[in-house]
């Protein structure tokens, strides 16, 4: 028996469900009561799902993995995974037995989209050219971990005097600060880019000082 | 058996550069935030640094080393890189290659048995 | 930066009593604080991961607990391999990733 999988890792959003899929091509006269299946965790090799001795015998995973019982006799293994957390993510074999065996393993790769920046100015008021001031941008509920690229009004990247810090909530997504501290020209536009590097999804923020008011 | 092994330690005076390797086995390396932190001798533990998983490249380093150390990874050769520029003496220590147990949370499962290096003139 | 201060510097204790060892950080880090142990020469081994959940293959004799800012944990029989250098380490808020100073146990 061969098991075929994809090759490209699948991509699902937190809070989704998501399918891995794994395909084996059953002989003339195969019946379901021949079939091993088993998926696991490929590391851990901890069970997630298995159907033997002729029967699904459900989800070891949290309960929210499933088969798809009427497709199984036409060689479809595929698990669906309700539900998507953080910690879904990694490697997990499919193993199937009939015969001989065989296994091949797919990649889960969780991700949640940054909300749009929220940029605050510190101090945010009598700013004058020449000032020193902290602009911070912050972005939330995302995963996996974003990338922070700062910009002027001319788009020329500002690098110097940026700190980025990541904080990790309950549910393993991440909010994440980055803080350009910059002295005023005459007058300026401040961006900052926020990029969730698997959806290749940017999110933008900017502040624009022209003395008084400031525009967000 | 996950296995870490540290490797490309040795003497150097200040100023002068040496790459650390790890090499990791056991577990799907390309799934797995890597991590380097060092152990002054008689000293406690200090993270270093740290890379993203698969191949998005995202680092971060302790202050005392940015802009001198650069941590990179080769996922086809299950290889973890810290490219040490500029030493110092205050560098010296043991450093451990350490995987982060999960991508959102930090915390080190695994450790190397480190590779010492030593600054001095 | 996220401080974290572990109490007392040295333990003694006699081997088969209760070790009892503190970590406070200087914010909340909620549940996002693990525990090492590392014994001379050796590296850190993972003991306790989210302020609670024991490592793969740590005997049940250590146990963490704690939220917010103050941790404990807590050794219940000790065991001669047990004598050793312990570090907590939060992942809350990064970077840095943070260690305590570690509190040292020894034979009383």
């Known amino acids: 028996v061969e098991v075929q999988v994809s090759e490209d890792p699948v991509v699902a959003l937190v809070d989704t469900d998501a399918t891995l899929r794994c395909s084996f091509s059953p002989e003339p006269g195969f019946s379901l009561a021949q079939l091993n299946l088993i998926w696991q965790l490929t590391d851990t090799k901890q069970l997630v799902h298995s159907f033997t001795e002729g029967r699904d015998q459900g989800s070891a995973y949290s309960n929210r993995t499933a088969l798809f019982p009427d497709l199984l006799v036409q060689g479809n293994a595929s698990l669906r995974l309700q539900r998507v957390r953080v910690t879904d993510e990694g490697s997990y074999t499919c193993f199937v037995s009939i015969q001989d065996f065989d296994s091949a393993a797919v990649s889960l790769q969780v991700a949640a989209p940054y909300s749009k920046p929220s940029m605050t100015l510190e101090p945010n008021k009598d700013l004058r050219p020449g000032n020193m001031v902290t602009i911070t941008c912050s972005s939330y509920q995302g995963y996996p971990e974003a990338e922070v690229f700062w910009k002027d009004g001319q788009g020329v990247p500002l690098t110097g005097n940026v700190t980025t810090s990541q904080m990790a909530n309950e549910r393993g997504l991440f909010d994440v600060h980055s803080v350009l501290r910059v002295v005023l020209g005459a007058n300026g536009t401040y961006s900052c880019l926020v990029r969730n590097p698997v959806l290749q999804q940017d999110a933008h923020g900017s502040v624009t000082i022209t003395g008084q008011p400031l525009t967000f | 058996d996950v296995q870490l092994v540290e490797s490309g330690g040795g003497v150097v005076r200040p100023g002068e550069s040496l790459r650390l390797s790890c090499a990791a086995s056991g577990f799907t390396f390309s799934n797995y935030a890597m991590n380097w932190v060092r152990q002054a001798p008689g000293e406690g533990l200090e993270w270093v640094s740290r890379i993203n998983y698969k191949g998005y490249n995202i680092t971060y380093y302790a202050d005392s080393v940015k802009g001198r150390f650069t941590i990179s990874r080769d996922n086809s050769k299950n290889t973890l890189y810290l490219q040490m520029n500029s030493l110092r003496a205050e560098d010296t220590a043991v450093y451990y290659c350490?995987?982060?147990?999960?991508?959102?949370?930090?915390?080190?499962?695994?450790w190397g048995l480190g590779t010492l290096v030593t600054v001095s003139s | 930066e996220i401080v974290l201060t572990q109490s007392p510097g040295t333990l003694s204790v006699s081997p088969g009593e209760r070790a009892t060892l503190s970590c406070r950080a200087s914010q909340s880090v909620n549940s996002k604080l693990a525990w090492y142990q590392q014994r001379p020469g050796q590296a850190p081994r993972l003991l306790i991961y989210?302020?609670?959940s024991r490592a793969t293959g740590i005997p049940d004799r250590f146990s963490g607990s704690g939220s917010g800012t103050d941790f404990t944990l807590t050794i219940s029989r000790l065991e001669p391999e047990d004598f050793a250098v312990y570090y907590c380490?939060?992942?809350?808020?990064?970077?840095?990733?943070?260690f305590g100073g570690g509190t040292k146990v020894e034979i009383k």
């Open positions: 350490a995987k982060s147990g999960s991508n959102s949370n930090n915390f080190f499962d695994y």
């Open positions: 380490q939060q992942y809350k808020n990064w970077p840095p990733l943070t």
């Open positions: 989210d302020a609670s």
